[in-house]
Interface confidence: low
């Protein structure tokens, strides 16, 4: 089996109206507190030079970073949405734990590193921005991994 066949999520993950609504509500709440509108974390640049078959692996990297470095340190904010969305995203992360790629991941690592550096450079407002883009993270995971 090719290694990246494990880079799959069930479509049912994205068809639960309640948690989808909570994820989008969380993103909306955070985007209201985001003053930096000229920076986009999850956009065309993130996928530049990454083939369609490797995009789920890329999104796995972004998801794990978002969970560990953004959502958990900010987990006391944006209640009650945060306490419901974090376990949902953790479940998706666990489902992608065996997702790896066999080929060259240089472009992926470069793009993920750029996203991480942008968030870190912006400090806490970068974390707020990342939470404000959870709707984009959600849609990108769906598009790349289903």
């Amino acid at each position: 089996l090719p290694v990246n066949t494990r880079c799959k999520l069930e479509v049912s993950n994205f068809q639960q109206p309640y948690i989808v609504n909570r994820t989008f509500m969380l993103a909306k709440e955070a985007s209201l507190a985001d003053n930096n509108t000229d920076v986009r974390l999850i956009g065309e640049k993130l996928f530049r030079g990454v083939s369609a078959k490797d995009q789920c692996y890329l999104m796995k990297q972004v998801l794990n970073f978002t969970l560990e470095d953004v959502l958990l340190p900010q987990s006391d904010r944006f209640q009650p949405y945060m306490q419901e969305v974090v376990p949902f995203l953790t479940k998706l992360s666990n489902q992608l734990s065996s997702c790896h790629i066999s080929g060259d991941d240089q472009n992926i690592q470069k793009n993920v590193r750029r996203l991480k550096e942008t968030v870190k450079k912006l400090g806490e407002s970068g974390e707020i921005k990342a939470i404000g883009e959870l709707d984009l993270l959600f849609m990108s995971l769906r598009n790349a991994c289903v």
Partner: antibody, heavy 117, light 107 residues
């Protein structure tokens, strides 16, 4: 219910150090920011810094950077404020407090630190 | 860091009066929070995220405002409301700042 219990009052000489503790209970300690805030006698509230116990990440008020260390021990759900090179002007009530969203919702009872020669 | 200026710094009012305290931020903030502190006690959260009432807080307390101008109101002052009130923001990362406080006394 959420409780923050601080260590007892301290009397120190100028130039000395002090370490104040804040024992948390009633919630998941690693998941919420703990802030340290001080209040000199008869004055207002001044934010010192905060720690996210889950990762150990800290932020400090620039005014206190270098003289203050905030730490946490997840295993015993306790946060610490260590202050070095104390001055008479550091005499204050020191509070630990737990965040909720953007606010500081739960406060310890305070620890009075008196710096006097 | 964003500066918060409370007005007035102190006031004296009678039981039943409507009391208003303002908090002005040096630049725009997302939310304002309000605390009361009685002598010898720790501060207590009253209003969070500008207008939400903290658990167990009486409905005579309210908050409003946006941007740089925020207001805290006690609709009908009670004797037990004698205290110092503080506004606070956490929008200028990573700083938290407090207003200088407003002391409310009962006539």
């Amino acid at each position: 219910q959420v409780q923050l219990v601080q260590s007892g009052a301290e009397v120190k000489k100028p130039g000395a150090s002090v370490k104040v503790s804040c024992k948390a209970s009633g919630y998941i300690f690693r998941s919420y920011w703990i802030h340290w805030i001080r209040q000199p006698p008869g004055k207002g509230l001044e934010w010192i810094g905060r720690i996210y116990p889950g990762t150990g990440r800290t932020y400090y008020n620039e005014k206190f950077k270098g003289r203050v260390t905030i730490s946490a021990d997840k295993s015993i759900s306790t946060a610490y404020l260590q202050w070095s090179s104390l001055k008479a002007s550091d005499t204050a009530m020191y509070y630990c407090a737990r965040s909720y969203d953007y606010s500081v919702a739960y406060w310890g009872q305070g620890t009075l630190v008196t710096v006097s020669s | 860091a964003i500066q918060l200026t409370q007005s007035p710094s102190s006031l004296s009012a009678s039981v039943g009066d409507r009391v208003t305290i303002t908090c002005s931020a040096s630049s725009s903030v997302s939310y304002m929070h309000w605390y009361l502190q009685k002598p010898g006690q720790s501060p207590q959260l009253l209003i969070y995220e500008t207008r939400k009432l903290a658990s167990g807080v009486p409905s005579r307390f309210s908050g409003s405002g946006s941007g740089t101008d925020f207001t805290f109101t006690i609709s009908s002052l009670e004797a037990e409301d004698a205290a110092t009130y503080y506004c606070q923001q956490w929008s200028s990362n990573p700083y938290i700042t407090f207003g200088q406080g407003t002391k409310v006394e009962i006539k």
